[in-house]
């Protein structure tokens, strides 16, 4: 037999075994020009010493073979003895290691069998009614195709599916979408309506994420507030990576899960922008304000479940940094200015009340005054901090108030509102004899003592009603009792107590009269 012809004799090897795990497979035969044809196949297993034979049976009942040697591709013409206008059955027999393995057969009309390409280029993936929709441009001059897909997950083998007939310039396929695992898809095509036409090769992998992105399992920690009034948010635990099928490992466009950090600054609600979304890799610096932080996972199908944390406000207070002067026109606060052209947010809320009741005021951008101070003033009519109670004040600063991550904490402190000097006056002053020349003076704590750092000291004044001599005794803010000694029996005294703040002298309590009785010895 001539090598260019199909040999109508017995092949030069024994009968073929029934199928084995190795051997020839995926036989494809098609016309490649007006009078030439090509068959190609794959061979699984060791290739050393393997000889391949392309077998062909005609509709007449005669069978022949081409010897391909070690090649897995063979071309022949329409003069090779194979009928190209009628149906033929072709298969491959591979002779190796004293045994013959055979491929599955294909039955086709060679003249009408065109080499079909798999979907080429960009395969668009979208979600449609809980299913996956893939769409691609039909390869040139190949309108009219049957399309199959195969898919696998990281833990399951390939499963075959059918896309149905296609007859347009774009082709599409509806495939199953997994809820929680990534999938790898491949597609192949063959000529529509051509009996036994060969399938194309499988397309490149299409990697598809699960419908639900994995919930981010991350933990945060927040550093101490630094000198600049900012603290770093750090990620303690990276989000778990999605397990991918074999063909999607390494570079797998389509399965990416993006994690975004959504910051919501709860403090200072009067600022322009309260939320900001960042990439998880870029951990921000925060002010000492309270924040809610959410990590949102999303893939090409949209966002998944998010995980939310609350970052409480930094409650470290600066008892001396804020200077408050109360005048007839209103109240002015002074604090060390941060820099030129800073916007400040002054937030206050009654101590012991829910954080949701905070009030705030945003200043216009301001430069430091000659003393290097920034100021905020308000009138009595505004009602700001007007009630006689303890307020917690925080001042935030930013050169770019529209950028949530550029706020810093200037200071946090306490302030007693309203007419503090009168409201702070101690009540229930009582005097008890202590010894022959001393008494113990007690009083109820001033309202100012409920406000940490506000009450600087108590002052107890004792007046000798005879000589009109007055003595004043400072008392620590934590004490509510003092012993007055060196008193004379039979003399009338009055005692008063006042509570002072760092910037305000208190109002004296009502005078309390007392005297030490003269002791008469028997």
């Amino acid at each position: 037999c001539r090598t260019s012809e199909c040999c109508f004799q017995d092949p030069p090897y024994p009968d073929a075994d029934s199928g084995s795990a190795s051997g020839p497979r995926d036989l494809r035969c098609y016309r490649i020009s007006s009078d030439r044809y090509e068959c190609s196949w794959q061979y699984e297993g060791p290739t050393a010493g393997v000889s391949h034979f392309l077998r062909c049976c005609l509709s007449s009942g005669r069978c022949c073979y081409f010897a391909a040697g070690s090649a897995t591709r063979l071309q022949f013409s329409d003069q090779a003895g194979v009928s190209v206008l009628y149906t033929v059955t072709l298969w491959v027999e591979s002779w190796a290691r004293n045994q013959t393995e055979k491929s599955p057969e294909v039955t086709l009309q060679l003249y009408n069998s065109v080499k079909y390409e798999p979907p080429l280029g960009d395969i668009k993936v979208s979600k449609l009614a809980g299913q996956l929709r893939m769409e691609w441009e039909t390869p040139d001059n190949q309108v009219g195709a049957e399309v199959q897909f195969r898919h696998r997950t990281p833990s399951s083998p390939w499963k075959l599916g059918d896309c149905g007939p296609q007859d347009d310039d774009t082709e599409s396929c509806l495939c199953p979408l997994e809820m929680n695992v990534a999938q790898e898809f491949q597609l192949r095509r063959r000529q529509l309506g051509s009996q036994g036409s060969s399938w194309s090769k499988w397309s490149s992998p299409v990697c598809v994420p699960p419908e639900n992105p994995p919930q981010p399992q991350v933990r945060f920690s927040v550093e101490q507030l630094g000198q600049d009034g900012r603290r770093r948010l750090t990620l303690k635990e990276q989000p778990t990576q999605l397990e991918l099928p074999e063909g999607c490992q390494g570079l797998a466009p389509g399965t990416e899960v993006t994690y975004r950090l959504q910051l919501h600054m709860l403090s200072c609600p009067c600022k322009a922008k309260a939320t900001r979304t960042l990439h998880l890799g870029k951990m921000p610096y925060l002010s000492g304000a309270a924040y809610n932080v959410a990590v949102i996972s999303s893939n090409q199908f949209g966002p998944g479940l998010n995980q939310t944390w609350h970052i409480p406000a930094d409650t470290h207070t600066e008892p001396v940094a804020l200077n408050i002067s109360v005048g007839t026109n209103g109240t002015t606060m002074y604090w060390p200015a941060r820099a030129q052209s800073m916007t400040y947010c002054i937030e206050w809320q009654p101590v012991g009340q829910d954080g949701g009741l905070a009030t705030c005021s945003l200043t216009a951008p301001q430069d430091p005054d000659p003393a290097g101070m920034a100021t905020y003033s308000w009138s009595r009519e505004s009602g700001a901090m007007g009630q006689e109670k303890c307020y917690y004040i925080t001042i935030f600063a930013s050169a770019h108030p529209e950028k949530l991550t550029l706020w810093s904490t200037v200071l946090s402190t306490y302030h007693f509102g309203g007419n503090a000097s009168a409201a702070g006056t101690p009540h229930h002053v009582s005097v008890k004899n202590h010894s022959l020349d001393s008494v113990s003076v007690d009083w109820a704590p001033s309202l100012l003592s409920t406000c940490p750092g506000v009450l600087k000291e108590y002052v107890v004044r004792c007046r000798d009603e005879d000589s009109k001599q007055v003595s004043e005794h400072p008392v620590q803010p934590t004490e509510t009792q003092v012993t007055l000694s060196g008193l004379r029996a039979g003399v009338a005294y009055t005692v008063q107590v006042r509570a002072d703040t760092a910037w305000l002298r208190g109002v004296w309590s009502q005078p309390q009269r007392f005297s030490i009785e003269v002791q008469v010895s028997d």
């Epitope: 092949p11 077998r55 049976c57 009942g61 005669r62 069978c63």
Partner: nanobody, 111 residues
Framework: EVQLVESGGGLVQPGGSLRLSCAVS????????VNWYRQAPGKQRELVAL???????KYADDVKGRFTISSDSARNTVYLQMNSLRPEDTAVYSC?????WGQGTQVTVSS
């Protein structure tokens, strides 16, 4: 001269088995398609199974899983192993290759 000779037919009870042989001379079973046909009285002849080039096998739907066609190239013979026989399998079974036919062998399935 091409000849095909069938043997192995006979009477068998329902559920039983038979093995038919088709001895071929003049052509090789490895370079041709060998078919087994059957014809029941008053019915059309129908293709039961075929073997192509001694390797590729095809079956009619109603015998799939019950009948097996095979070849032995050393003996140049094609076999039809018939299991789970039914009364409706009763017919004359003939083999053919190219345009040549054997004379046929009778298979009767009856209790």
């Amino acid at each position: 001269e091409v000849q095909l000779v069938e043997s192995g037919g006979g009477l068998v009870q329902p559920g039983g088995s038979l093995r038919l042989s088709c001895a071929v001379s003049g052509i090789s079973v490895r370079s041709s398609v060998v078919n087994w046909y059957r014809q029941a009285p008053g019915k059309q002849r129908e293709l039961v199974a075929l073997i192509m080039g001694g390797a590729i096998t095809k079956y009619a739907d109603d015998v799939k899983g019950r009948f097996t066609i095979s070849s032995d190239s050393a003996r140049n013979t094609v076999y039809l192993q018939m299991n789970s026989l039914r009364p409706e399998d009763t017919a004359v079974y003939s083999c053919s290759a190219l345009e040549y036919w054997g004379q046929g062998t009778q298979v009767t399935v009856s209790s």
